[in-house]
């Protein structure tokens, strides 16, 4: 025999107290799949969290962080303070990157500038605490009259690498 609860759609639960009929999820709860015997309590976005997507009868609320903070962890389980570009977050707050390191994001750590010579290239543009060094072509890549060429294997990410 088919389980009568399997007919209960998302947004409802199979109510054992009412002959296993499908009852709507109570306020502030949801069921994202059919055949559920209970509804889950909606996540509440409080304090440094703010609501990005309201809870519905079929899906949980989604949180992000208030301005000045960014999400960490699966499903934005934590909020961490932003820093300025060229800084990193320490136990004592945001601190400027040391010479020879950079951070082009509002989160993460300061990372050492790229060492162009490891790839046989020269420094095309010096680094700063906000930006990485740009490596130029190796001498063999330069053709007469060319002011520059894209490094055959240039840098890494969008303005930075992820943390």
């Amino acid at each position: 025999l088919q389980d009568p609860c399997s007919n209960c759609p998302a947004g409802t639960f199979c109510d054992n107290n009412r002959n296993q009929i499908c009852s709507p999820c109570p306020p502030n709860s949801f069921s994202s799949a059919g055949g559920q015997r209970t509804c889950d309590i909606c996540r509440q976005c409080k304090g440094v969290f703010r609501t990005r997507k309201e809870c519905s009868s079929t899906s949980n609320a989604e949180c992000d962080c208030t301005p000045g903070f960014h999400c960490l962890g699966a499903g934005c389980s934590m909020c961490e303070q932003d820093c300025k570009q060229g800084q990193e977050l320490t136990k004592k707050g945001c601190k400027d990157c040391c010479f020879g390191t950079f951070n082009d994001q509002k989160r993460g750590i300061c990372r050492p500038w790229t060492n162009c010579s490891l790839d046989g290239k020269s420094v095309l543009v010096n680094g700063t605490k906000e930006r990485d060094v740009v490596c130029g072509p190796s001498p063999a890549d330069l053709s007469p009259g060319a002011s520059s060429v894209t490094p055959p294997a240039p840098a890494r990410e969008p303005g930075h690498s992820p943390q």
Epitope: Q85, R107, P154
Partner: antibody
Framework: EVQLLESGGGLVQPGGSLRLSCAAS????????MSWVRQAPGKCLEWVSV????????YYADSVKGRFTISRDNSKNTLYLQMNSLRAEDTAVYYC????????????????????WGQGTLVTVSS | QSVLTQPPSASGTPGRRVTISCSGS????????VTWYQQLPGTAPKLLIY???HRPSGVPDRFSGSKSGTSASLAISGLRSEDEADYYC???????????FGCGTKLTVL
């Protein structure tokens, strides 16, 4: 020669889903950041998302955050974009783009721009 | 509305020089590298300038980029009919944690 070939575009109803793919060849796919960039008919270029090759870290434009998911399979040299809860304003040509700057040679690819582009695949969201 | 501001159009006659501006803020252009792209009608964009002012191999030296403060410029000298295209500036924006493009400048060669 860098080659990027997008596929998976088509007509979809509002609220629907679509998965785009980008097959890459001619370079070491696993060493480069990859982005999706879109362009609505007659409109500007709009960056959508980027994924890094090492840790798989991802970033998204606010307009698609929570609806789109970028991923990559380095063993298949393929980039993906899963698009859910599609809206009319998502109608655009979607380009797959390779960033300059091979990891681990350098740490930041932003300086080098997007030096390889596919020809794009059209996504139309309409009822 | 784009975070980077470009004039919607520019024009010039063959052989002349034209400049396209791109204005931003300290969270993007001010502290990050600017790149420029050329998009010919009906084609995908092509990288024209990287790291503010450097040309990839194969890009003619008629194209040059510069940056000052929170603004960048693309200059095209010795204008040719084949330069007729849309030109986009782009950079990383740390406050948005994403790349940003200008809305493009349509260059017409008269």
């Amino acid at each position: 020669e860098v080659q990027l070939l997008e596929s998976g575009g088509g007509l979809v109803q509002p609220g629907g889903s679509l998965r785009l793919s980008c097959a890459a060849s001619g370079f070491t796919f696993s060493g480069y950041d990859m982005s999706w960039v879109r362009q609505a008919p007659g409109k500007c270029l709009e960056w959508v998302s980027v994924i890094y090759p090492d840790d798989g870290n991802t970033y998204y434009a606010d307009s698609v955050k929570g609806r789109f998911t970028i991923s990559r399979d380095n063993s298949k040299n393929t980039l993906y974009l899963q698009m859910n809860s599609l809206r009319a304003e998502d109608t655009a040509v979607y380009y797959c783009a390779k960033h300059g700057g091979q990891k681990p040679t350098t740490k930041s690819s932003s300086a080098y721009g997007m030096d390889g582009w596919g020809q794009g695949t059209l996504v139309t969201v309409s009822s | 509305q784009s975070v980077l501001t470009q004039p919607p159009s520019a024009s010039g006659t063959p052989g002349r020089r034209v400049t396209i501006s791109c204005s931003g803020s300290s969270s993007n252009i001010g502290n990050n590298y600017v790149t420029w792209y050329q998009q010919l009608p009906g084609t995908a964009p092509k990288l024209l300038i990287y790291a503010d002012s450097h040309r990839p191999s194969g890009v003619p030296d008629r194209f040059s980029g510069s940056k000052s403060g929170t603004s960048a410029s693309l200059a095209i000298s010795g204008l040719r009919s084949e330069d007729e295209a849309d030109y986009y500036c782009a950079t990383w924006d740390y406050s948005l944690s994403g790349y940003v493009f200008g809305c493009g400048t349509k260059l017409t060669v008269l």
